[in-house]
């Protein structure tokens, strides 16, 4: 029950996180005009990853896309890439985790397969969250650097922009959304990985009872389950006829490195 709750909660938290990462990536307020200690203007500038906007009087807003790839700073391109990678990994992770949910039955899917998928989606969420956090942090660092350099525009050189009024930019709402969303995705991923442990069938403590017959030595192993993440063999309850040769179940009696997160 606790495993199902952990997995379900991990999925929901990751879902919220990925929705947040998508929202942050699409938002225009990555950097906003710094109003503190600046001449007060009747227009308000703010910029996103894809376009820059100017809000004039009476809420009249005009946005212009960055219709160039080569003219944009490498850092901005890197941030875009990190956010997109984060979204893609997160989306795949969500897809995988839906099928991995314990509360959803799909055919005769084994618990071991579900554990494997849960771990995979968990790792994907962790990487997705890290990508988002990294992307937002790189952008924030770029802002801080430019702020102290007092550049007139963050994307100087883009479209032959002239440095005129000292418009300084500070952290926009998208950065905070991105950080929180990345953190949630990361937490959700960790929860999925924790849930994976509980989902995986564990090795029982029963000793194998041997019955000696005249011709053959037949060992009956009542609970031969072991934790599997898909990297090992797909084991089931098996009757083991031990005629000198040992089955796969007996070969690996110690937990593998994939059994625990």
């Amino acid at each position: 029950m606790a495993v199902t709750a952990c997995q379900g909660l991990g999925f929901v938290v990751s879902l919220i996180g990925i929705a947040g990462i998508i929202a942050a990536t699409c938002m225009d307020q990555w950097s906003t005009q710094d109003l503190y200690n600046n001449p007060v203007t009747a227009v308000f500038n703010y910029q996103g990853l894809w376009r820059s906007c100017v809000r004039e009087s009476s809420g009249f807003t005009e946005c212009r896309g960055y219709f160039t790839l080569l003219g944009l700073p490498a850092m901005l391109q890197a941030v875009r890439a990190l956010m997109i990678v984060g979204i893609v990994l997160g989306a795949i992770g969500l897809l995988v985790s839906i099928f991995a949910l314990k509360c959803i039955r799909i055919g005769s899917m084994e618990d071991s397969a579900k554990a494997n998928m849960t771990l995979t989606s968990g790792i994907m969420f962790i990487v997705s969250g890290l990508c988002a956090i990294a992307g937002v942090s790189v952008f924030a660092n770029m802002l801080v650097t430019n702020f102290w350099m007092s550049t007139a525009n963050m994307y100087t050189g883009m479209g032959g922009m002239v440095q005129t009024v000292q418009t300084r930019y500070t952290f926009g709402a998208a950065l905070f959304v991105g950080w929180v969303a990345g953190g949630l995705t990361l937490i959700g991923g960790v929860m999925m990985c924790i849930a994976c442990r509980g989902l995986a069938p564990e090795e029982t403590n029963y000793k194998a009872v041997s019955y000696h017959a005249s011709g053959h030595s037949v060992a009956y192993k009542p609970g031969g389950f072991k934790a599997s993440t898909g990297f090992g063999s797909n084991t089931k309850n098996k009757k083991i006829y031990d005629g000198g040769a040992r089955t796969e179940d007996e070969v690996q009696s110690y937990p593998s490195k994939h059994d625990y997160v």
Partner: antibody
Framework: QVQLKESGGGLVQPGGSMKLSCAAS????????MNWVRQSPEKGLEWVAE??????????HYVESVTGRFTISRDDSKSSVYLQMNRLRAEDTGIYYC??????????WGQGTTLTVSS | DIVETQSPSSLTVTAGEKVTMSCKSS????????????LTWYQQKPGHPPKLLIY???TRESGVPDRFTGSGSGTDFTLTVTSVQAEDLAVYYC?????????FGTGTKLELK
């Protein structure tokens, strides 16, 4: 069509108070940034005050010479903007225009109301 | 505070003549965010409120005849009337619509010979 009509002007003694009103129609008043601009032979056209819309928290701005004496306010339910003027001086004399600031331009102006500060 | 200086203070012209008036701002009115100049031109006839002519330094307001042209960038701006008509006789004001206070220029009076 857009209309702005000022009222409340008149003769007032120095140090006195006066409240100007501007009734607007023909546009979504609650979205607009509203301004007061005055004109006198001595100073020409002079921007006095601005009040922004609800989305901009009804933020206000004033010219330095009236800061602390004049207060701009609005009532979106009545589509009206007001200018409360206290501690009036002779140099406040002039025609007061109510204007709408849209897209960084004063696109509509009222006919104006005259304020005379004299003893 | 930003100061808008207009020159000349008055212009005496004949009908059909081309006229140019200048407006200089003490600080650049060019916004780096959209590369737009926040300077506006108004026309005021006696006994009337000012009327919007040109905004964003060069964009003509709808209904304004195309003989009125605004140009310039940064701190130096110009209003040109290509062929002056009798109805164009008025005072022309430029205004900074970027920095507070949103100051107006001193005005240029257009008179007929």
């Amino acid at each position: 069509q857009v209309q702005l009509k000022e009222s409340g002007g008149g003769l007032v003694q120095p140090g006195g108070s006066m409240k100007l009103s501007c009734a607007a129609s023909g546009f979504t008043f609650s979205d607009a940034w509203m301004n007061w601009v005055r004109q006198s032979p001595e100073k020409g056209l002079e921007w006095v005050a601005e009040i922004r819309n609800k989305a901009d928290y009804h933020a206000t701005h004033y010219v330095e010479s009236v800061t602390g004496r004049f207060t701009i306010s609005r009532d979106d339910s009545k589509s009206s903007v007001y200018l409360q003027m206290n501690r009036l001086r002779a140099e406040d004399t002039g025609i007061y225009y109510c204007t709408r600031n849209y897209g960084s331009r004063f696109d509509y102006w009222g006919q104006g109301t005259t304020l005379t500060v004299s003893s | 505070d930003i100061v808008e200086t207009q020159s000349p203070s008055s212009l005496t012209v004949t009908a059909g003549e081309k006229v140019t008036m200048s407006c200089k701002s003490s600080q650049s009115l060019l916004n780096s965010g959209n590369q737009r100049n926040y300077l506006t031109w108004y026309q005021q006839k006696p006994g009337h409120p000012p009327k919007l002519l040109i905004y964003w330094a060069s964009t003509r307001e709808s209904g304004v005849p195309d003989r009125f042209t605004g140009s310039g960038s940064g701190t130096d701006f110009t209003l040109t009337v290509t062929s002056v008509q009798a109805e164009d006789l008025a005072v022309y004001y430029c205004q900074n619509d970027y920095f507070y206070p949103l100051a107006f220029g001193t005005g240029t009076k257009l008179e007929l010979k």
